[in-house]
């Protein structure tokens, strides 16, 4: 008789997961010095640890905490860069600019980067089937509570200019429903943080208005305002002439507004 | 601008004790939880025991668990850890960091720990 399996609405486990979480922490070991250390082995044992034999919609913050102690990382705080609904762009910007930080450029954010997993109340088996859809099932499921437990944290961590990333092109450029509204904005520490700005990226060649005054924005800034941080705001016209200019700053095209 | 001081340090045998305290100014110490983490010879960065603001929760990392306690003096702005038969294996330069990881921006020059017979 096939045992019974909870239908969830969201996508399954992401193909190979194990696989795939060892093979990136090797790669990020190998490609950042400083985490060479890391015994990757012991770090899939934590991730698995999380949420294997768990009830995929009764996950806490404190089950990510033997894998939080492994992820232990350097990061200055004040080269991070937050990003909502455009994270392509953020990540080629961070290529280009070493010295700044995504939560992704991180190494727990980027064994997760992309990936869904969950598993089953007492057994050990990952779910490849199906996993609880954030709005339909459940909010306390493994990946809304582990990019909520690293994106608060790693809010906190940051101090003085705070930059995000905004997309232009959405209805909603600042949504207080994304990670960065409702977790990242208010984890934000007011003593630390001087100035949350913001880069307001546009889509349309022609698109020459003045996106900083939209009234998302404006409910921004009322938001960063009220918690005592300070709160500047830039249009980035031409995202790729942005990239071209952080890859080459000297150039001469490079002086004018992008 | 936030600023920490570490000291405490030195040269110890093994099964010997030390305690680290912790100087902290430029925030509302009792706002923030603390941590300590140690990097030794040629390793990377490893955490080693948080703590809340309040000081009333605590967490340590499991190789230190049972021989190292993390406390604060909010009145004093003071972080500390007393460590206990300390092992070769302990020998690291140890820093205080606001906030419980795991992402970390120490500002101190930290604190030299060597245990060796």
């Known amino acids: 008789v096939p045992r019974w399996r909870q239908q969830w609405s969201g996508p399954g486990t992401t193909k190979r997961f194990p696989e795939t979480v060892l093979a990136r922490c090797v790669k990020y070991t190998e490609i950042h010095p400083e985490m060479r250390h890391v015994d990757c082995q012991s770090v899939w044992d934590a991730f698995k640890g999380a949420f294997i034999s768990k009830h995929p919609c009764n996950i806490t913050e404190e089950d990510y905490q033997p894998l939080m102690k492994l992820g232990t990382q350097t990061v200055p705080c004040n080269k991070i860069l937050l990003w909502s609904r455009i994270k392509d762009l953020a990540h080629q910007f961070t290529q280009v600019q070493r010295d700044m930080f995504t939560l992704e450029d991180t190494l727990l954010g980027y064994l997760a980067d992309d990936l869904t997993w969950c598993g089953e109340f007492n057994t050990s088996k990952i779910n490849y089937q199906s996993c609880p859809d954030w709005r339909k099932d459940c909010s306390n499921n493994p990946v809304s509570v582990f990019w909520k437990t690293v994106s608060r944290r790693f809010a906190e961590a940051a101090c003085d200019v705070v930059h995000v990333m905004l997309n232009g092109s959405r209805s909603k450029i600042f949504d207080k429903n994304s990670t960065f509204g409702s977790v990242e904005v208010h984890n934000l520490q007011p003593e630390k943080v001087q100035t949350l700005e913001a880069w307001v990226i546009h889509g349309g060649r022609e698109d020459s208005r003045d996106l900083c005054q939209d009234p998302t924005i404006k409910e921004l800034e009322s938001i960063i305002s009220k918690r005592n941080i300070q709160f500047s705001c830039k249009n980035i016209y031409r995202p790729d002439k942005f990239l071209q200019c952080v890859k080459n700053p000297e150039d001469s095209s490079c002086t004018s507004e992008i | 601008e936030v600023q920490v001081l570490e000291s405490g340090g030195g040269l110890v045998q093994p099964g010997e004790s030390l305690r680290l305290s912790c100087a902290v100014s430029?925030?509302?110490?009792?706002?923030?939880?603390m941590s300590w983490v140690r990097q030794a010879p040629g390793k990377g960065l490893e955490w080693v025991s948080g703590i809340s603001g309040s000081g009333g929760s605590t967490d340590y990392a499991d190789s230190v668990k049972g021989r190292f306690t993390i406390s604060r003096d909010n009145s004093k702005n003071t972080l500390y850890l007393q460590m206990n038969s300390l092992r070769a294996e302990d020998t690291a330069l140890y820093y205080c960091?606001?906030?419980?990881?795991?992402?970390?921006?120490?500002r101190g020059q930290g604190t030299l720990v060597t245990v060796s017979s």
């Open positions: 960091a606001d906030g419980t990881g795991p992402f970390f921006d120490y």
């Open positions: 430029g925030f509302t110490f009792s706002n923030f939880a």
